[in-house]
């Protein structure tokens, strides 16, 4: 029961996490910035992985995709890649984990197969979460680096002077969504891996080996456990209370993974 709960909870936590990673990737608020201020109007800027938007205090809003920009930072491409890899791995992990859930019966799927699938999905969730956390962290680092490096300077350019303006910037909501979502996916993955240990059969699969004596003799082990000379041994190691000796045919059972010699 505890294994089923751990697996189910891991699945739900990962599902929420991956939904968060998708949301963060699509959000425009990865960074926010005050672009312009005068006594009448303030121009506020928020940027995502795919487009940048300006919003004015008057209510005017305009968004523009980065496809118009030639010199995109290489780090941005790396962040995009990390987030997409995280989403893809997470989606595959979710698909695998659905079939691995103990509460869902699919044909005659063995527990060992479900355990393997649970472990696979768990590892996928862990990698997905790490990708998201890495992507968001790389972006945050890029922001801090770029803003601190572009200190106020003025230089002569073609047609006049160029001045870098110092503006206030903050981490956007998407960064926090990404960090939390990545963490949840990671936790969900760990829970799936823990559940996998409980799903896997604990007993070692021994092959039974028996030796035939010359006659149909029946031996008794101390403590009342019946031992037999043939393959039809008492597989459950049940005590014999009736005290009567039985022939091999009378106790015939099929070999199982719990066979003992």
């Amino acid at each position: 029961m505890a294994v089923t709960a751990c697996q189910g909870l891991g699945f739900v936590v990962s599902l929420i996490g991956i939904a968060g990673i998708i949301a963060a990737t699509c959000m425009d608020q990865w960074s926010t910035q005050d672009l312009y201020n005068n006594p009448v109007t303030a121009v506020f800027n928020y940027q995502g992985l795919w487009r940048s938007c300006v919003r004015e205090s008057s209510g005017f809003t305009e968004c523009r995709g980065y496809f118009t920009l030639l010199g995109l930072p290489a780090m941005l491409q790396a962040v995009r890649a990390l987030m997409i890899v995280g989403i893809v791995l997470g989606a595959i992990g979710l698909l695998v984990s659905i079939f691995a859930l103990k509460c869902i019966r699919i044909g005659s799927m063995e527990d060992s197969a479900k355990a393997n699938m649970t472990l696979t999905s768990g590892i996928m969730f862990i990698v997905s979460g790490l990708c998201a956390i890495a992507g968001v962290s790389v972006f945050a680092n890029m922001l801090v680096t770029n803003f601190w490096m572009s200190t106020a300077n003025m230089y002569t350019g073609m047609g006049g002077m160029v001045q870098t303006v110092q503006t206030r910037y903050t981490f956007g909501a998407a960064l926090f969504v990404g960090w939390v979502a990545g963490g949840l996916t990671l936790i969900g993955g760990v829970m799936m891996c823990i559940a996998c240990r409980g799903l896997a059969p604990e007993e070692t699969n021994y092959k039974a080996v028996s030796y035939h004596a010359s006659g149909h003799s029946v031996a008794y082990k101390p403590g009342g456990f019946k031992a037999s000379t043939g393959f039809g041994s008492n597989t459950k190691n049940k005590k014999i209370y009736d005290g009567g000796a039985r022939t091999e045919d009378e106790v015939q059972s099929y070999p199982s993974k719990h066979d003992y010699v």
Epitope: V43, N45, E56, E62, G159
Partner: nanobody, 120 residues
Framework: EVQLVESGGGLVQPGGSLRLSCAAS????????MGWYRQAPGSQRELVAT???????YYADSVKGRFTISRDNAKNTLYLQMNSLRAEDTAVYYC??????????????WGQGTLVTVSS
């Protein structure tokens, strides 16, 4: 890099009118705001008027009601219609453009300036 070309300056009598224009060209992501500044001989550069991408305008108290700032977003051109000019309006007028640079600080570009002389 943004290039700014100003035009329309010259000599005008008090009470007269002039129209300044500033054309921005080059490769840039987005112009956030444009404005006009002026610098009279022996004085500091001061703000005359600004206009944002959304069309919000701001004027210095000394020019309110006399000057009108406008822009053509499609042509990336800024205009300043100056009416009822006074002798104290004599200055070099500079065009200013604030350009958004994704993931970095914005850049302010300044034109070379155009001289406006109000004299009888």
């Amino acid at each position: 890099e943004v290039q700014l070309v100003e035009s329309g300056g010259g000599l005008v009598q008090p009470g007269g009118s002039l129209r300044l224009s500033c054309a921005a060209s080059g490769s840039f992501f987005r112009i956030v705001a444009m404005g006009w500044y002026r610098q009279a001989p022996g004085s500091q550069r001061e703000l005359v008027a600004t206009i944002t991408r959304g069309g919000s305008t701001y004027y210095a108290d000394s020019v309110k009601g006399r000057f009108t700032i406008s822009r053509d977003n499609a042509k990336n051109t800024l205009y300043l219609q100056m009416n009822s000019l006074r002798a104290e309006d004599t200055a070099v007028y500079y065009c200013n453009v604030r350009v958004e640079v994704p993931f970095m600080q914005p850049n302010d570009y300044w034109g070379q300036g155009t001289l406006v002389t109000v004299s009888s």
